[in-house]
């Protein structure tokens, strides 16, 4: 058993049929010595008396808010949560496996630049009685500070019969140099509590590997005289690291109709303009990627050919 | 240590092309190592990230773009020299700060060159003959060093009398290649910045 936060404790249980469970001793936070009784949750049934209560925690029915009282007055609470371990593996029931970039990916993180600011998100089908707490650091043995905000519900989607909820959190490394060469990864730890179930999820990454620039901005077209070709130009996104001559981007320019199966014109360039062939009912799209370290491409920025 | 004096080639900035080739060569070599050594811990997640140049050179700090010198976090690690003006373009009056940056890059290349050559000598003794260093990568390191045009003491190649542990050597190769790729990215960024200056 360990303390998650004040008056909240996590009991780690090997979860299998007829498991013996864990013996837990609760102590009432009071100077009083006698006349103390214990109850669980909303029940008025007295579970025991005395300053300490010894319980055998085997299942979720044994978890919950234990309260010690004296003469009708509440003295203190202890909330017990369960963390299940099945076949030596901690449960991951609360969050959905996003399966990208690989299986067992519960947390996904992205950074728009090298400033040390990043966003992580996760998915769940659970809509109520759900809380998250996020901590982060650079390295684990001698951790350096990363400050994370509160996790918030950022999107709701309908997936077949199920509703899916996306939560996200923004974090900022306390003293980040955009030009630094990372040798210790960022560690992100998410504590998830659903009712009386506790789970924790972790992710470890270098900022350079989670870079995904914003789409290029200010796309403009200029038809070329006596030609099917148009010159398309754009600018670096405002959120990208500066100076741009140091943090350079490369671009992919594509002309395509509505359908992915349609024919297309495609060209890659390090410049902020390109010449392509425009077709009726097609659109020109441009996306960006770090020129020197191939992490993710940005989303497309698009303008219609006409 | 005496600072070597930079004498960049006249004409179009020569180092940019070589640094692009360097990044390409080390990326290809790393990809090849990951594929060939698939049963070894050779991915970014699996290896320890070591920097053989740590405390010996200060490329990131010495080559920091002027715009980032206002960022406290970029300056806190040690006495920092940064590029204040000039560029590796045709000018003979290369600034002292830039000479410091380019000499730091040169020292990096020299250290990695020695490590890679030593390692290759060991890998050539491996009866499995599983992986060797790409000669193109070694050639590209050499070309960039020549383009930087510094005169510095030659570092003797380390020779080892004991029987090499090929498993450890291959893991060390992965660690070196990952670190060198990150440094090659920095070098490419620096050259691109200088070229635009």
């Amino acid at each position: 058993i360990w303390e998650l936060k004040k008056d909240v404790y996590v009991v780690e249980l090997d979860w299998y049929p007829d498991a013996p469970g864990e013996m837990v001793v609760l102590t009432c936070d009071t100077p009083e010595e006698d006349g103390i009784t214990w109850t669980l949750d909303q029940s008025s049934e007295v579970l025991g008396s005395g300053k300490t209560l010894t319980i055998q925690v085997k299942e979720f029915g044994d978890a919950g808010q234990y309260t010690c009282h004296k003469g009708g007055e509440v003295l203190s609470h202890s909330l017990l949560l369960l963390h299940k371990k099945e076949d030596g593996i901690w449960s991951t029931d609360i969050l959905k496996d996003q399966k990208e970039p690989k299986n067992k990916t519960f947390l996904r993180c992205e950074a728009k630049n090298y400033s040390g600011r990043f966003t992580c998100w996760w998915l769940t089908t659970i809509s109520t009685d759900l809380t998250f707490s996020v901590k982060s650091s650079r390295g684990s043995s001698d951790p350096q500070g990363v400050t994370c905000g509160a996790a918030t519900l950022s999107a709701e989607r309908v997936r077949g019969d199920n509703k899916e909820y996306e939560y996200s959190v923004e974090c900022q490394e306390d003293s980040a140099c955009p030009a630094a060469e990372e040798s210790l990864p960022i560690e992100v730890m998410v504590d998830a509590v659903h009712k009386l179930k506790y789970e924790n999820y972790t992710s470890s990454f270098f900022i350079r590997d989670i870079i995904k620039p914003d789409p290029p901005k200010n796309l403009q077209l200029k038809p070329l005289k006596n030609s099917r070709q148009v010159e398309v130009s754009w600018e670096y996104p405002d959120t990208w690291s500066t100076p741009h001559s140091y943090f350079s981007l490369t671009f992919c320019v594509q002309v395509q109709g509505k359908s992915k199966r349609e024919k297309k014109d495609r060209v890659f360039t390090d410049k902020t303009s390109a010449t392509v062939i425009c077709r009726k009912n097609a659109s020109i799209s441009v996306r960006a990627q770090d020129r020197y370290y191939s992490s993710s491409w940005s989303e497309w920025a698009s303008v219609p050919c006409s | 240590r005496n600072l070597p004096v930079a004498t960049p080639d006249p004409g179009m900035f020569p180092c940019l092309h070589h640094s692009q080739n360097l990044l390409r060569a080390v990326s290809n070599m790393l990809q090849k190592a990951r594929q060939t050594l698939e049963f070894y811990p050779c991915t970014s997640e699996e290896i320890d990230h070591e920097d053989i140049t740590k405390d010996k050179t200060s490329t990131v700090e010495a080559c920091l773009p002027l715009e980032l010198t206002k960022n406290e976090s970029c300056l806190n690690s040690r006495e920092t020299s940064f590029i204040t003006n000039g560029s590796c373009l045709a000018s003979r009056k290369t600034s002292f700060m830039m000479a410091l940056c380019l000499s730091s890059i040169y020292e990096d290349l020299k250290m990695y060159q020695v490590e890679f050559k030593t390692m290759n000598a060991k890998l050539l003794m491996d009866p499995k003959r599983q992986i060797f260093l790409d000669q193109n990568m070694l050639a590209v390191i050499d070309e960039l060093m020549q383009a930087l045009n510094f005169n510095s003491e030659t570092v003797p190649q380390k020779s080892s009398l004991e029987e090499p542990d090929f498993y450890k050597t291959k893991i060390k190769l992965c660690i070196l290649l990952h670190a060198f790729r990150i440094r090659a990215v920095t070098i490419d960024r620096v050259m691109s910045y200088l070229n635009a200056s």
């Epitope: 099917r228 199966r261 349609e262 024919k263 360039t269 009726k280 | -």
Partner: antibody, heavy 118, light 107 residues
Framework: QVQLVQSGAEVKKPGSSVKVSCKAS????????LHWVRQAPGQGLEWMGW????????EYAPKFQGRVTITADESTSTAYMELSSLRSEDTAVYYC???????????WGQGTLVTVSS | DIVMTQSPLSLPVTPGEPASISCRAS??????LHWYQQKPGQAPRLLIA???QSISGVPSRFSGSGSGTDFTLTISSLQPEDFATYLC?????????FGQGTKVEIK
């Protein structure tokens, strides 16, 4: 299976014109860009131009501009390349080729040898 | 027009050995470079698109690398059927242009 079948070999006199056909099968004709590329004996490949059969748009290499005309007939899934004012250096194998990507080629015809000789 | 220069023009290789062919552009073309294989009397066959993207149906022993002006096609272990002429093509701008070809022959 996408296939491009070209017309047979031709022998032409200098100053005359040649029209080579290329019939496509497999896949929708207008879903692809069609290119013409030639190869003189023992030489490399030389791109001549492309057509978008969907709208008839064409683009020609400056070297052939004014001498080459590329057309397409959607009803018969056939493309044509006509080269006029022939000279001996136009002796080559002419390939039609296609792709959904405009700038490179993934399917080639078998080639048509055009010999220009007096 | 962008000029594509291949080297060497002829490359004698022992079967089972690796081979590398170089292609250089007269100006920077990013990764807009494609590789083809051509056998005598046959049309070319696409091997690699955009410098390094593999094409389905092409054996994994063929790989490409490069960007800017310098590109390389690598065949990791030459098979008897790989003895042919290899051509690079730029698609950075029109007109599309090809290299003159590198003939890989049996040593």
């Amino acid at each position: 299976q996408v296939q491009l079948v070209q017309s047979g070999a031709e022998v032409k006199k200098p100053g005359s014109s040649v029209k080579v056909s290329c019939k496509a099968s497999g896949g929708t004709f207008s879903d692809y860009y069609l290119h013409w590329v030639r190869q003189a004996p023992g030489q490399g490949l030389e791109w001549m131009g492309w057509i978008d059969p969907e709208n008839g748009d064409t683009e020609y290499a400056p070297k052939f501009q004014g001498r080459v005309t590329i057309t397409a007939d959607e009803s018969t899934s056939t493309a044509y390349m006509e080269l006029s004012s022939l000279r001996s250096e136009d002796t080559a194998v002419y390939y039609c080729a296609r792709n959904k990507e405009l700038r490179y080629i993934d399917v080639w015809g078998q080639g048509t040898l055009v010999t220009v000789s007096s | 027009d962008i000029v594509m220069t291949q080297s060497p023009l002829s490359l004698p290789v022992t079967p089972g050995e690796p081979a590398s062919i170089s292609c250089r552009a007269s100006q920077s073309i990013s990764i807009n470079l494609h590789w083809y294989q051509q056998k005598p009397g046959q049309a070319p066959r696409l091997l690699i698109a955009f410098a390094s993207q593999s094409i389905s149906g092409v054996p994994s022993r063929f790989s490409g690398s490069g960007s800017g002006t310098d590109f390389t096609l690598t065949i990791s272990s030459l098979q008897p059927e790989d003895f042919a002429t290899y051509l690079c093509q730029q698609s950075n701008s029109f007109p599309l242009t090809f290299g003159q070809g590198t003939k890989v022959e049996i040593k």
